[in-house]
């Protein structure tokens, strides 16, 4: 808290300009009018105030706007944004994407701070959904943003926004998140032709059900092993050897290197050994010839 002291003669600020960087903290407190500061916020970021001087400017704005800053001020906070706490930000009503971009720019290159997370949360809640432009902006600044959302939050993403998603944006998503995103992606890309569709849908396939994988196996997609390894185990298990061979195309040879890892390991255990032998990869662990496989899940469903 800066002490209240009288402004020295001739130092009263008539405008926000570069001369103010030479003011000590108490001089800024005494000589800069909060209303002047608020109306000339666009100049603040052009002036290289030090971190400590920004404390004083924030204190002035807090006194002027105890219920939260108006968007006209928020838009021009610049480096002052670094001084804001999540509690400050919760008082804001940010509706403009330009304001959001301006504040994210200040934090560019850094981890997502609690302040930024709160800002994004306020913005998205205010909009009611994650529209394409917002998602575009957020993933440009924070590629991992999408995967930081809960499945419930992801459910508010409209399919049209999926076009903004890049493969790297999904790198840290877990299966529960992909379960929500995959149907949206399927809907978003439904009018694309086979090969183009596969390029777009590939990153989302960790949420695909068995029937969609079976359908893909009929389209000569040549799925790479990295994508295959991210598929849901429960979706891979019912696939036949022939379907996996068609799905992977020339990449089928990669199964050998992954035979001890899920989902390949679990899939092998479900296949007849003589079917696996047709691949010529030396995959071991399939059901020996002559054994009868009972599908208990089907039996349970019938009873």
């Amino acid at each position: 808290e800066v002490e209240k002291t009288a402004c020295p003669s001739g130092k009263k600020a008539r405008e926000i300009d570069e001369s103010l960087i030479f003011y000590k903290k108490w001089e800024l407190e005494a000589c800069v009018d909060a209303a002047l500061l608020a109306t000339q916020m666009d100049r603040v970021n052009a002036i290289p105030f030090t971190y400590e001087q920004l404390d004083v400017l924030k204190h002035k704005l807090d006194e002027l706007y105890p219920q939260g800053y108006p968007e006209s001020v928020i838009q021009h906070l610049g480096y002052l944004f670094l001084k804001m706490s999540p509690e400050d930000i919760r008082k804001w009503n940010v509706t403009s994407l330009e304001t959001l971009k301006a504040l994210l720019e200040v934090n560019k290159g850094h981890e997502m701070s609690p302040q930024v997370a709160t800002l994004i949360d306020r913005f998205v809640k205010g909009r009611g959904q994650l529209d394409k432009d917002t998602l575009d902006t957020l993933t440009a600044f924070y590629p991992g943003y999408l995967c930081s959302l809960s499945p419930e939050e992801l459910s508010s993403v409209p399919p049209s926004s999926i076009w903004a998603v890049r493969p790297q944006d999904l790198d840290t998503c877990d299966p529960r998140q992909l379960d929500v995103l995959y149907p949206k992606a399927r809907l978003a890309f439904q009018n694309m032709n086979g090969s183009e569709y596969f390029v777009k849908i590939q990153s989302f396939l960790g949420g695909a059900p068995t029937e969609d994988l079976k359908a893909l196996s009929q389209q000569n997609v040549s799925m790479d092993l990295a994508t295959f390894m991210k598929l849901r185990t429960d979706a891979v298990l019912p696939l036949t050897v022939a379907e996996v061979q068609k799905l992977l195309g020339p990449h089928v040879e990669g199964l050998k290197a992954e035979e001890r890892h899920r989902p390949v390991r679990d899939w092998i255990l479900r296949q007849r050994q003589d079917d696996l032998d047709t691949l010529g990869l030396g995959l071991q662990g399939g059901i020996p010839n002559g054994y009868l496989v009972l599908d208990l899940s089907m039996q349970e469903a019938l009873s």
């Epitope: 960087i21 030479f22 052009a46 290289p48 030090t50 971190y51 400590e52 480096y79 670094l82």
Partner: antibody
Framework: QVQLQQPGAELVKPGASMKLSCKAS????????MHWVKQRPGQGLEWIGM????????IYYEKFKSKATLTVDKSSSTAYMQLSSLTSEDSAVYYC?????????????WGQGTTLTVSS | DIVMTQSHQFMSTSVGDRVSVTCKAS??????VAWYQQKPGQSPKLLIY???TRHTGVPDRFTGSGSGTDFTLTISNVQSEDLADYFC?????????FGAGTKLELK
């Protein structure tokens, strides 16, 4: 990587003026304030002032207001400092330097410095 | 202006020793202090900022401490390459000001 290139040495007569240069590379020249710092032999460092290449805004330490003039040429990513009415007191090493985060004005990158000798 | 005073112009040390360089500010500057190392014929290099945060690539034998008006740069297990001038700088307010420097030399 960030580089600030300065000529090694300059010799000038008393009363004359001298324009020192600092060529920047490895970063977006117009993004950061360019600062100038003076160091006299065996003495500490003195901050002279700064210029923002994007806006041409300049801020000078009062002590150097009538001595130094800062300019930039965006097309060549070069900053200049003109020193006028030179005396032996102006003999020093002059550094250009940039500060990446303006709110934390520590000098992140420095040029190699130009040794200015004022002598008849 | 804030004056930064480095009371020792020279300090003698031996390789392997621990040495502390001090700096005093004329006003409270919080933790807005940086330390630089300068070797002969070279430009200064940033070592520490926010009084105690090591700059990228700086060996952990360099540590900074202090707040308010009194600051210390400590070099533990001094190496021959550490023999240089050390300057403190405050960035609490403009004009940015530096200490006069402390030269670290061999005993």
């Amino acid at each position: 990587q960030v580089q600030l290139q300065q000529p090694g040495a300059e010799l000038v007569k008393p009363g004359a003026s001298m324009k020192l240069s600092c060529k920047a590379s490895g970063y977006t020249f117009t993004s950061y304030w360019m600062h100038w710092v003076k160091q006299r032999p065996g003495q500490g460092l003195e901050w002279i002032g700064m210029i923002h290449p994007n806006s041409d805004n300049t801020i000078y330490y009062e002590k150097f207001k009538s001595k130094a003039t800062l300019t930039v040429d965006k097309s060549s990513s070069t900053a200049y400092m003109q020193l006028s009415s030179l005396t032996s007191e102006d003999s020093a090493v002059y550094y250009c330097a940039i500060i990446i985060t303006p709110v934390v004005p520590k000098f992140d990158y420095w040029g190699q410095g130009t040794t200015l000798t004022v002598s008849s | 202006d804030i004056v930064m005073t480095q009371s020792h112009q020279f300090m003698s040390t031996s390789v392997g020793d621990r040495v502390s360089v001090t700096c005093k500010a004329s006003h409270d500057v919080g933790t807005s202090v940086a330390w630089y190392q300068q070797k002969p014929g070279q430009s200064p290099k940033l070592l520490i900022y926010w009084a105690s945060t090591r700059h990228t690539g700086v060996p952990d034998r360099f540590t900074g401490s202090g707040s308010g008006t009194d600051f210390t740069l400590t070099i533990s297990n001094v190496q021959s390459e550490d023999l240089a001038d050390y300057f403190c700088q405050q960035y609490s307010s403009y004009p940015l000001t530096f200490g006069a420097g402390t030269k670290l030399e061999l005993k």
